[in-house]
């Protein structure tokens, strides 16, 4: 039959070449001469000419050694034609299977494999997997079947069989207990891969097993007992540095220390932190220590790691005896800020209060006092007793020194320690109001028209506090009531000044007496400028011909000078007949008023 069974050809054949493989034969050769040919990769297409066929005999030849790892199988077609070139058979499949020879050693995928395992793990724990490849066939033969083994282990501690390797998977695992990073941090295994499932060619590689740190070592104090001296009252003072050693990997969570005060700090005076570089425990004061209350503290400090212990380990404890050093403490005023009510205007030498300080120290130290800041200079302080007395007039209304009725004084206490220390206290004098100020109108100068005059509203102010203020009462004095009226409004805080009779354009003094609710009277002279105008006015219109009240021409200025000279020369006469003169001025004004009125009527 025109059929060829698959042809098996071992790779790496030694020849000689060409080498016969098989004879193609068609049974049609009885009837006619047959010519044979082959096609396909390895014959007439790349790789060309590996196989050939003798045209007349049909012998299939191999022309070179084959390499299974390059091409494992060739699929060719055999053809049979008659002398005239006509095909006498269908193309025939020719399968040439290249059989494997063990011509490759195993090759590890890396020269050095790196793996890691936690110290102290149980036998059976997987560490890593190594891989070796072999190009030879591992399906139909053992040529490419790799078996793994461990050739050697360095170091051989605690013994030489700490690891095993699975012969077929290459998985390295722990076989013995006793892995201790602190003793052996790394193992170097020489591993072997052997083909023929362990009976063939061998290759080696290195597997480095890093032993990872577990927190199997507790930090230990060195030393375990500490003694420290700390000045009292200091906050944030470094008391002591506690040193620990830990055999685990430096700067790892298994090495970094965590400190806790587990006893002796009932008052919560201390805190302990870990120094980031040295890993020491830094003990500091959280609150100031008080020598007088407790001169020694015995603290118990425990140390653990940031990471929990991997195995049960005892926790180390250190003892720190802290001696409190006595410090000369400053006297403390009691209270630190003292509020005292005192009436303003009390007589000089009158006692204000006693303000004293206490010394926290146990010794009976002498305390002396003095005033540190007394802005108005109103007070004195007895150095021995702390008695504060008035030496000036306390004035509640003094806006320069008094704010919201309070006068603030700072006092100082000094002990006789070595060196002496000082403490300060604040004395807040709340000044009680006295009716020592009368009411005052504002403004004290007005300008008003002598025809249809507008009422002048003046505000009344009184520096005192209620009840020494409104309601106010107003009264015109010194005959000012002839031409003027003064009325306090309903609220009692303003006074309305009105011109009730015509006055010629000039400046006049209006004598206004105001009294407060406590009948404190204050006389104020209002300077009234009367202008020739109607209704509302700001300044007098037109040239000013009046005396001292106006400004204007040179004649007016001369007139003023003349009046002044006359006043100096005849001063006594003026004093004697002052009232008559004043009346004469208002009378002249009255005559003028009557004339103006007459003029108006004629008009």
């Amino acid at each position: 039959d025109w059929v060829v069974a698959p042809i098996s050809v071992p790779e790496n054949g030694k020849g000689p070449f060409p080498q016969r493989l098989n004879q193609l034969k068609s049974n049609k050769d009885r009837d006619t001469k047959i010519f044979y040919s082959i096609t396909g990769p390895g014959a007439d297409s790349p790789p060309e000419g590996v196989f050939a066929v003798e045209k007349e005999t049909g012998w299939l030849l191999l022309n070179k050694p084959l390499d299974r790892e390059e091409i494992a199988k060739y699929e060719l077609f055999g053809h049979a034609v008659s002398e005239n070139g006509a095909s006498v058979e269908d193309p025939m499949n020719i399968s040439i299977i290249v059989t494997d020879q063990n011509d490759h050693k195993p090759k590890f995928t890396q020269d050095t494999f790196r793996g890691s395992v936690l110290e102290g793990v149980l036998p059976g724990t997987s560490v890593m997997q190594v891989t070796a490849t072999d190009e030879d066939d591992a399906i139909y033969t053992y040529n490419g079947v790799v078996a793994y083994s461990i050739h050697s282990q360095e170091p051989k501690d605690p013994h030489d069989l700490m690891f095993t390797i699975h012969r077929s998977t290459g998985t390295i695992s722990v076989i013995s207990s006793g892995l201790d990073r602190e003793k052996v941090p790394e193992y170097t295994l020489t591993i072997q891969a052997t083909d023929m499932d362990g009976d063939g060619s061998t290759t080696t590689a290195v597997a480095v097993v890093e032993i990872l740190d577990a927190n199997d070592n507790a930090p230990m104090f060195e030393p375990q007992k500490y003694e420290a001296w700390v000045p009292e009252n200091e906050v944030g003072h470094e008391v002591q540095r506690l040193t620990v050693t830990d055999l685990d990997v430096p700067n790892s969570p298994a090495w970094r220390a965590t400190y806790h005060i587990v006893g002796g700090d009932d008052g919560d005076h201390f805190t302990i932190t870990t120094h980031p570089e040295t890993n020491q425990g830094v003990l500091t004061t959280k609150k100031g220590l008080d020598f007088e209350a407790q001169d020694q503290h015995t603290l118990y400090v425990e140390v653990t790691n940031e990471a929990p212990f991997a195995v049960k380990l005892p926790t180390a404890t250190a003892t720190v005896v802290v001696h409190v050093k006595d410090v000369n403490e400053a006297p403390v005023f009691v209270p630190p800020s003292k509020v005292v009510e005192v009436q303003e205007g009390i007589p000089t030498g009158e006692p204000v209060c006693v303000y004293t300080a206490e010394d926290p120290d146990k010794e009976n130290q002498k305390i002396s006092y003095r005033i540190l800041r007394d802005p108005a200079g109103w007070l004195a302080m007895d150095p021995d007793s702390g008695q504060v007395t008035a030496v000036g007039t306390l004035d509640r209304e003094d806006e320069q020194f008094v704010r919201n009725n309070i006068y603030e004084v700072m006092v100082l206490a000094m002990d006789n320690g070595s060196p002496p220390t000082t403490g300060t206290g604040t004395l807040l004098l709340t000044l009680i109001d006295v009716n020592d100020h009368g009411p005052v109108p504002e403004p004290r100068q007005i300008t008003i028209c002598n025809q249809s005059p507008v009422r002048q509203v003046l505000n009344i102010t009184d520096k005192d506090l209620s009840p020494h203020t409104s309601p106010f009462q107003a009264q015109l004095t010194d005959d000012s009531d002839i031409y003027w009226t003064a009325e306090v409004n309903e609220e009692g805080d303003t006074v309305v000044l009105s011109l009730k009779k015509f006055l010629k354009q000039d400046t006049y003094d209006v004598h206004l007496s105001l009294s407060d609710h406590g009948n404190k009277e204050q006389l104020t002279v209002i300077r009234a400028t009367v202008c020739d105008c109607h209704g509302h006015v700001e300044t007098c219109p037109g040239p000013w011909k009046g005396g001292s009240g106006g400004g204007g021409s040179g004649a007016g200025v001369i007139a003023v000078i003349v009046v002044v000279v006359i006043a100096i020369v005849a001063g006594i006469v003026v004093l004697v007949i002052s009232r008559k003169k004043r009346m004469a001025k208002y009378e002249k004004a009255e005559i003028k008023e009557m004339g103006e009125m007459h003029r108006e009527l004629n008009a």
């Epitope: 030694k14 020849g15 000689p16 070449f17 060409p18 016969r20 004879q23 010519f35 060309e48 000419g49 590996v50 050939a52 066929v53 003798e54 045209k55 007349e56 005999t57 012998w59 299939l60 030849l61 022309n63 070179k64």
Partner: antibody, heavy 118, light 107 residues
Framework: VQLVEESGGGLVKPGGSLKLSCAAS????????MSWVRQTPDKRLEWVAT????????YYPDSVKGRFTISRDNAKNTLYLQMSSLKSEDTAMYYC???????????WGQGTTVTVSS | ELVMTQSPSSLSASLGEGVSLTCRAS??????LIWLRQEPDGTIKRLIY???SLDSGVPKRFSGSRSGSDYSLTISSLESEDFVHYYC?????????FGAGTKLEIK
């Protein structure tokens, strides 16, 4: 009838070169592997070179490797042997022979004489 | 390389007599051996291939056989044209190697 006929032999000095030819007829030359075989003056036969039918692969014994080159021109039905660096021990009758039935040496030529002498 | 030891180097025999020539292979070559004859004019012809297969046109008095590493050519009844040189060639190992030859002479 398969016929092969050698030519190109002659006298050559040691170190010289010579090219032998072999003309084939009567068979499909391109389908057969071809060889050169020599017979020394003491009548011993020695294989010299072989070439595959397509000319892709060549084979030599160590004695001539690097000095002799076998080649073929299937279009001209001719086989060649280029000889260089000739030595006195290369003196021989050179035959061209074909493979047949996939084995050596089915058909032989009459031979051509090569004499290497100073 | 593989050595083929051919014996005898020469042999005298009479017409009609049967003779055997032997080649011994120094390594295993399987059946990969041929026998050649060389005429006095130098013409060479293959007689037997694959140890025992006769080439076309070769008389049936010629036969080949093998016994282990010894390979034999037997001529059952010598004829006058048979008194020539005979050579063996192995093609089971590279390089191809020949026997030294046997000269068959008429007695």
């Amino acid at each position: 009838v398969q016929l092969v006929e050698e030519s190109g032999g002659g006298l050559v000095k040691p170190g010289g070169s010579l090219k032998l030819s072999c003309a084939a007829s009567g068979f499909t030359f391109s389908s057969y592997a071809m060889s050169w075989v020599r017979q020394t003056p003491d009548k011993r036969l020695e294989w010299v070179a072989t070439i595959s039918s397509g000319g892709h692969y060549t084979y030599y014994p160590d004695s001539v490797k690097g000095r002799f080159t076998i080649s073929r021109d299937n279009a001209k039905n001719t086989l060649y042997l280029q000889m260089s660096s000739l030595k006195s021990e290369d003196t021989a009758m050179y035959y061209c022979a074909s493979y047949y039935y996939g084995i050596p040496f089915g058909y032989w030529g009459q031979g051509t004489t090569v004499t290497v002498s100073s | 390389e593989l050595v083929m030891t051919q014996s005898p180097s020469s042999l005298s025999a009479s017409l009609g007599e049967g003779v055997s020539l032997t080649c011994r292979a120094s390594q295993d070559i399987g059946i990969n051996l041929i026998w050649l004859r060389q005429e006095p004019d130098g013409t060479i012809k293959r007689l037997i291939y694959d140890t025992s297969s006769l080439d076309s046109g070769v008389p049936k008095r010629f036969s080949g056989s093998r016994s282990g590493s010894d390979y034999s050519l037997t001529i059952s009844s010598l004829e006058s044209e048979d008194f020539v040189h005979y050579y063996c060639l192995q093609y089971g190992s590279s390089p191809l190697t020949f026997g030294a030859g046997t000269k068959l002479e008429i007695k």
